[in-house]
């Protein structure tokens, strides 16, 4: 025959524990009922009744399968740097994270202590890693050939356009400016003639730019077949 | 490049006070300007910063007492309602946005500092 | 908030000694750290940025090291120069912070 199943409250055996989701009551020297996620122990167990449980108030939460007398206080609301992630229930705790733009600058077991905003690169500096949920933006001088012309928490530095005559040199803060040349030269075979060199730009996404009024003459190397830009001239 | 404050003046307590802090060879639309305090003999008592978009940001015993706003060639720290605890000479500093960091957190240039003398 | 803490409030030393300034600050700032030098009369001059890069026109006798929650500036050779009290100042976070600056240490140079 099976062993009889006991029923909550019962004497464990001498030198076992009880069961999954039971506790060991010292007063009433019983295994008895943990309550559930969102209750806790209204009334603790004696020999001859198990614990009974009850809801936790409203801003008050139990997680685990607990026998607290009083549910745990949820965390105050977010501050206006912070948004909720997860809200406040019988089950569950409030977590606050940083909003866009914001990192958490000193944490807590769970959620934020104290959001900050992310630092950004100054023009002739790029990101060097970008800012997470937990730490800073850190900026790096644009390496020569490249450039950052943006104060930016995400812009990289980037390539300077590739001129066939070049007007004005690119510095770190500066695209290269390239010379305007005769509407009749042809372009040379398999290159790409764009406005603005769009695939050597920053990976971040970003407003398209407007094009220049004057005619572009810029030209990048040859990239493989490639339709013409929008607005393009085929000089 | 520089910076210099003025405005500081004896007050009694109550009249609200606006210090003013001019920039020269540097746009203000491209740095942090700070707000620092210093008591006769006492240390230094950061007030606020704002930021190159025009956000202020407070010491937490400075927040409803002081107001820091700009133009685009001055910044001005606005006392509303002095004390004579508010004594002090105030600087006004620009962060140095070394490292590359539109917020390097260090300061330099300072201006020399304006008085404030708040008694009955 | 973060709160940093200077010691000693004051230190004398003879001409050509060395005198060592410790800052700390109650919470991980990383290397976000300055140093200040100020003489009477005068505002603050930056000496040391990111907790130990020299600032410009600053004698190599001054340095800054550290990280995360403890600094230290030491100045060797001291001059009479250099009498002036010293400010350790964390450039980490601005958001929810009573003071940035340290205390302040006065140094004395006999």
């Known amino acids: 025959l099976p062993a009889q199943v006991a029923f909550t409250p019962y004497a464990p055996e001498p030198g076992s524990t009880c069961r999954l989701r039971e506790y060991y009551d010292q007063t009433a020297q019983m295994c008895c009922s943990k309550c559930s996620p969102g209750q806790h122990a209204k009334v603790f167990c004696t020999k001859t009744s198990d614990t009974v449980c009850d809801s936790c108030e409203d801003s008050t939460y139990t997680q685990l399968w607990n026998w607290v007398p009083e549910c745990l206080s949820c965390g105050s609301r977010c501050s206006s740097d912070q948004v909720e992630t997860q809200a406040c229930t019988r089950e569950q705790n409030r977590i606050c994270t940083c909003r866009p733009g914001w990192y958490c600058a000193l944490s807590k077991q769970e959620g934020c202590r104290l959001c900050a905003p992310l630092r950004k690169c100054r023009p002739g500096f790029g990101v060097a890693r970008p800012g997470t949920e937990t730490s800073d933006v850190v900026c790096k001088p644009c390496a020569p050939g490249t450039f950052s012309n943006t104060t930016s928490s995400t812009d990289i530095c980037r390539p300077h356009q590739i001129c066939n005559v070049v007007a004005i040199p690119g510095n770190a803060s500066m695209d290269a400016v390239c010379t305007s040349t005769s509407p009749t030269r042809s372009m040379a075979p398999g290159a790409v003639h764009l406005p603005q060199p769009v695939s050597t730009r920053s990976q971040h996404t970003q407003p398209t730019p407007e094009p220049s009024t004057a005619p572009s003459t810029s030209f990048l190397l040859p990239m493989g077949p490639s339709p013409p830009a929008e607005g393009s001239t085929g000089d | 490049q520089s910076v210099e404050e003025s405005g500081g003046r004896l007050v009694t307590p109550g009249t609200p006070l606006t210090l003013t802090c001019k920039a020269s060879?540097?746009?203000?639309?491209?740095?942090?300007m700070t707000w620092v305090r210093q008591a006769p003999g006492k240390g230094l008592e950061w007030i606020g910063i704002?930021?190159?978009?025009?956000d202020s940001y407070y010491a937490t015993w400075a927040k409803g007492r002081f107001t820091i706003s700009k133009t685009s060639t001055t910044v001005d720290l606005k006392i509303s309602s002095p004390t004579t605890e508010d004594t002090a000479t105030y600087f006004c500093?620009?962060?140095?946005?070394?490292?590359?960091?539109?917020?390097?957190?260090?300061?330099?240039?300072w201006g020399p500092g304006t008085l404030v003398t708040v008694s009955s | 908030a973060i709160k940093m803490t200077q010691t000693p409030a004051s230190v004398s030393e003879p001409v050509g000694g060395t005198v060592t300034i410790k800052c700390q600050a109650s919470?991980?700032?990383?290397?976000?750290l300055a140093w200040y030098q100020q003489k009477p009369g005068q505002p603050p001059k930056l000496l040391i940025y990111?907790?130990?890069k020299l600032a410009s026109g600053v004698p190599s006798r001054f340095k800054g090291s550290g990280s995360g929650t403890q600094f230290t500036l030491t100045i060797s050779d001291l001059e009479c120069a250099d009498a002036a009290t010293y400010y350790c100042?964390?450039?980490?976070?601005?958001?929810?912070?009573?003071?940035?600056f340290g205390g302040g240490t006065e140094v004395v140079v006999k």
């Open positions: 500093a620009r962060d140095t946005g070394y490292g590359g960091y539109d917020y390097a957190g260090s300061f330099d240039p």
């Open positions: 060879g540097f746009s203000l639309s491209d740095y942090f």
């Open positions: 704002i930021n190159t978009g025009g």
């Open positions: 100042q964390q450039g980490y976070i601005y958001i929810d912070v009573g003071n940035i």
């Open positions: 919470e991980n700032i990383n290397s976000w």
């Open positions: 990111e907790a130990s």
